[in-house]
């Protein structure tokens, strides 16, 4: 008799995610020397550990902590740039300003980018069919809790100037609700952080609006001010342009607003 | 501390085969990676291969595609590297170093001559 | 495959002045994944610098490096008597992974 299984409403567990998570791990420490310490044996158990055999609805912070452990990461606090909606940007810039670092950068945000997974209560099973929707079904499911896990270390352990890029084509450029609105702004240390500065991507070529005066993003400086960090806002209006002149600052037309 | 510690020098006769050992110990065996590479008598540095045992991938460069064999002894936490159709240019100092493709840590070599 | 080039080949120096070494790809080396190594005589390489820029575990700061792309350098800001030896960059973003032919760097 085949055993009855909790239909949920998001897509399951990311095919092959055992080998990608071990495979994952491997690639990291082998290109991060500092991090080869790192057994992937461990990390992987831990990660299992803290979903497998549990209610997916019923995932805490404190499950994830062994991972946590393992995965610690000391990266400059100074050079963290966070992101809301617009991963891709983020991580392009990362890839060429080699000494700044997105979540996706460390080990646990890397093991992590882009996949799904969960498990079922009592049983050593992974839930390749469905897992939970953070809206239609439970907020405290193993993805999500994993990302405000991370999250709210990596905004924690900033320091000084914290960059963040958000997408100037949403509705929202500041959205509450995002994993930056909802977690990283309310975990920045005041006493750490002396300044966040927002740069508003802008999706057209013709768009020579100030979107630094968006009401969300005054929404933005007002939480910010309130928990007394300062705030500054800049534009890029060209994107491309903008990842070109990263990559050759000494180009000549590097020097006029980009 | 990690340390590689390899097998001594071996004379070989052309077209037999030489199998280099390699003992690592002091960090994460099965998920660490190892690659040989070898330097001829005072040239320069070839990457040969390697192994992520884990994973129980290997990753051959094509020149020594078909002559090259690596493996791994997981309970001994040992690398093996065993080269075959040996010729007299094969004459090398043979390093077994951790890392696939990133090389932080180097045994101390294997003298590996080919002479009839 | 990436064929990498260094220059020069030999570089006669005294203790106390700056070495630039240079290493230039065949073609892009993808994310900066280029690492220079130390090699002594009769001894085995030794990795100082990882990922085009980033020091190895107990690499004094006099070593630097920088470049992307095709262009690599390494810097040795003044040298000590124990620098003395010969230098290799290696690409380690496209397989197969490849060594320059190396720069010996020796005492005027």
């Known amino acids: 008799v085949p055993r009855w299984r909790q239909q949920w409403s998001g897509p399951g567990t990311t095919k092959r995610f055992p080998e990608t998570v071990l495979a994952r791990c491997v690639k990291y420490t082998e290109i991060h020397p500092e991090m080869r310490h790192v057994d992937c044996q461990s990390v992987w158990d831990a990660f299992k550990g803290a979903f497998i055999s549990k209610h997916p609805c019923n995932i805490t912070e404190e499950d994830y902590q062994p991972l946590m452990k393992l995965g610690t990461q000391t990266v400059p606090c100074n050079k963290i740039l966070l992101w809301s909606r617009i991963k891709d940007l983020a991580h392009q810039f990362t890839q060429v300003q080699r000494d700044m670092f997105t979540l996706e950068d460390t080990l646990l945000g890397y093991l992590a980018d882009d996949l799904t997974w969960c498990g079922e209560f009592n049983t050593s099973k992974i839930n390749y069919q469905s897992c939970p929707d953070w809206r239609k079904d439970c907020s405290n499911n193993p993805v999500s809790v994993f990302w405000k896990t991370v999250s709210r270390r990596f905004a924690e352990a900033a320091c000084d100037v914290v960059h963040v890029m958000l997408n100037g084509s949403r509705s929202k450029i500041f959205d509450k609700n995002s994993t930056f609105g909802s977690v990283e702004v309310h975990n920045l240390q005041p006493e750490k952080v002396q300044t966040l500065e927002a740069w508003v991507i802008h999706g057209g070529r013709e768009d020579s609006r100030d979107l630094c005066q968006d009401p969300t993003i005054k929404e933005l400086e007002s939480i910010i001010s309130k928990r007394n960090i300062q705030f500054s806002c800049k534009n890029i209006y060209r994107p491309d342009k903008f990842l070109q002149c990263v990559k050759n600052p000494e180009d000549s037309s590097c020097t006029s607003e980009i | 501390q990690v340390q590689l510690v390899q097998s001594g020098a071996e004379v070989k006769k052309p077209g037999s085969s030489v199998k280099v050992s390699c003992k690592a110990s002091g960090g994460p065996f099965r998920s660490s990676s190892f690659s040989w590479v070898r330097q001829a008598p005072g040239q320069g540095l070839e990457w040969m291969g390697g192994i992520i045992p884990i994973l129980g991938k290997t990753n051959y460069a094509q020149k020594f595609q078909g002559r090259i064999t690596i493996v791994t002894d997981e309970s001994t936490t040992t690398v093996y590297m065993e080269l075959s159709s040996l010729r007299s240019e094969d004459t090398a100092v043979f390093y077994c170093?951790?890392?696939?493709?990133?090389?932080?840590?180097w045994g101390q070599g294997t003298l590996v001559t080919v002479s009839s | 495959e990436i064929v990498l080039t260094q220059s020069p080949g030999t570089l006669s120096l005294s203790p106390g002045e700056r070495a630039t070494l240079s290493c230039r790809a065949s073609?892009?080396?993808?994310?900066?994944?280029l690492a220079w190594y130390q090699q002594k005589p009769g001894q085995a390489p030794r990795l100082l610098i990882y990922?085009?820029?980033s020091r190895a575990t107990g690499i004094p700061d006099r070593f630097s490096g920088s470049g992307s792309g095709t262009d690599f350098t390494l810097t040795i800001s003044r040298l000590e008597p124990e620098d003395f030896a010969v230098y290799y960059c290696?690409?380690?973003?496209?397989?197969?992974?490849?060594f320059g032919q190396g720069t010996k760097v020796e005492i005027k």
């Open positions: 170093v951790r890392g696939s493709s990133l090389f932080d840590y």
């Open positions: 073609q892009s080396v993808s994310s900066s994944y």
């Open positions: 990922g085009a820029s």
């Open positions: 290696q690409q380690y973003g496209s397989s197969p992974w490849t």
